[in-house]
Amino acid sequence: MKVLQEPTCVSDYMSISTCEWKMNGPTNCSTELRLLYQLVFLLSEAHTCIPENNGGAGCVCHLLMDDVVSADNYTLDLWAGQQLLWKGSFKPSEHVKPRAPGNLTVHTNVSDTLLLTWSNPYPPDNYLYNHLTYAVNIWSENDPADFRIYNVTYLEPSLRIAASTLKSGISYRARVRAWAQCYNTTWSEWSPSTKWHNSYREPFEQH
C-alpha cells in the first residue's frame, strides 16, 4: 500500500482543516488508514482523524482544531496499521480556504434597487471576520450568457445594484463567495444560491 498523491490540506481558519490524498489503488480509507495530527507545542497531544473515501483511491480527513493562530504548525503522520506511509507538516495560516458566506437574501422592495445581503461566516473574534472580501455572482436562469460577477471589496456583507441593470420580467439567481487577501487565501465555496423574479418600472420615454 502506497501513497500516490501526498496529502494536501486547507484550513477554514476556525475549527476544521481538510486533508485530501490519493492511494495507489482502491482503498477503504476508514478501515485501513489513520491520519495522526499534532500541534507543534510542548503540551499538545496527538489526535487521530479517521478518513473517508473520496473516489476509489482518494481519501479525505477533517481535522478538528480548537482554533487557529498564525504561528500554528502541525505534524501529520499517515498510518496503515503499524506502517508509516507518509510524514509531513501543515501550517494552517498558509493554506486558508475561508468558509462560505451564508443567508444570502435579495431584497427587492427598495425603489428599483436590488439589495443583496449575506452573513459573514466568521464570529467577530476570529481574525478573518474583518478581512473578508466577496464576489457576488448573478445569472439568468433563461439566458446562460447573462452571467456577471460583482467584486465587493469593502467589509460590509451587502451589495446594491440598480434593478435596471438586469432584464425585467425574468428570474435571476445569485450566490456569493469569500476570500481574504491578508492570508492570500483561496476562494471559499459558493454559498447556496437564491432566486428572485426581477421586475421594475420602465421609465416613461420622453418624445
Epitope: L43, E45, V69, A71
Partner: antibody, heavy 116, light 111 residues
Framework: EVQLLESGGGLVQPGGSLRLSCAAS????????MAWVRQAPGKCLEWVSA????????YYADSVKGRFTISRDNSKNTLYLQMNSLRAEDTAVYYC?????????WGQGTLVTVSS | QSVLTQPPSASGTPGQRVTISCSGS????????FNWYQQLPGTAPKLLIY???HRPSGVPDRFSGSKSGTSASLAISGLRSEDEADYYC???????????LGCGTKLTVLG
C-alpha cells in the same frame, strides 16, 4: 463559565508535605493541558509544573524537580500538586491555570507557607 | 534571574499610549510565541495577549502585542486608571521544556 478552585494550602514545616487540588468546571477538562504557577509574597510569577490533557507528558521547573509531582484525574475534573520536602523558598500563592497556548484561565490561588 | 527581561516599572497619564518591552537573551530561541498577563493588585493574573498578538475575547482592543525576533512588546493605548497593574510576559521555552516568565512591569497611571 470556566472556573478553577484551588484548595489544600496552609502552614507546613520545612521538610513537610502538602497536596494541592484544583477543581475545574465550565469546560471539558480532559481536553486541556493544565499547569501550576506560583508567586512568592511581593515577588514575580514563577511557572512550577504542567501536564498534558491525558497526563502522558509532564514538565517541571528545575526548582521543584524531584520534590513536586503534578497529576490529574479527568474523571473528577481535578488537578493535583503533591509537594514534598518543602523549603522556606516554596512559600507562595499557588495558582492553577488552564493551558490553551498560554495560561488562559487562572484560579484565585491558595497560600502555602513553609515555616518553622 | 529570569530569561526574559522586562523594565521593572512604566508610567503614563490617562489617555496616553504606553509600551512595555520583553527581551529574551541573545541565545534565547525565537521560535516560541509570547504571551502577556495582567495582574491587578490583590488578584490572580489574567491573560491579555497570546501567540504574540492575539487578544482573548473580552480584552479591549486598547491592548495590542507584537513580536520581533526574541523580543516582544505590549502596547496600551488610551491609558485608564484601571490599567494600573503588574504586566508579565511569558513564553514556552522548548530547550528547557518549560515556561519562562519575565519578572513583571509595574504600570502606574499618573494623575
Amino acid at each position: 463559565e470556566v472556573q478553577l478552585l484551588e484548595s489544600g494550602g496552609g502552614l507546613v514545616q520545612p521538610g513537610g508535605s502538602l497536596r494541592l487540588s484544583c477543581a475545574a468546571s465550565g469546560f471539558t477538562f480532559s481536553r486541556h493541558a493544565m499547569a501550576w504557577v506560583r508567586q512568592a509574597p511581593g515577588k514575580c510569577l514563577e511557572w512550577v509544573s504542567a501536564i498534558t490533557s491525558s497526563g502522558r507528558s509532564i514538565y517541571y521547573a528545575d526548582s521543584v524537580k524531584g520534590r513536586f509531582t503534578i497529576s490529574r484525574d479527568n474523571s473528577k475534573n481535578t488537578l493535583y500538586l503533591q509537594m514534598n520536602s518543602l523549603r522556606a523558598e516554596d512559600t507562595a500563592v499557588y495558582y492553577c491555570a488552564r493551558v490553551h497556548r498560554a495560561f488562559d484561565y487562572w484560579g484565585q490561588g491558595t497560600l502555602v507557607t513553609v515555616s518553622s | 534571574q529570569s530569561v526574559l527581561t522586562q523594565p521593572p516599572s512604566a508610567s503614563g497619564t490617562p489617555g496616553q499610549r504606553v509600551t512595555i518591552s520583553c527581551s529574551g537573551s541573545p541565545l534565547f530561541p525565537d521560535s516560541g510565541s509570547f504571551n502577556w498577563y495582567q495582574q491587578l493588585p490583590g488578584t490572580a493574573p489574567k491573560l491579555l495577549i497570546y501567540a504574540d498578538s492575539h487578544r482573548p475575547s473580552g480584552v479591549p482592543d486598547r491592548f495590542s502585542g507584537s513580536k520581533s525576533g526574541t523580543s516582544a512588546s505590549l502596547a496600551i493605548s488610551g491609558l485608564r486608571s484601571e490599567d494600573e497593574a503588574d504586566y508579565y510576559c511569558g513564553t514556552w521555552d522548548y530547550s528547557l521544556s518549560g515556561y519562562v516568565l519575565g519578572c513583571g512591569t509595574k504600570l502606574t497611571v499618573l494623575g
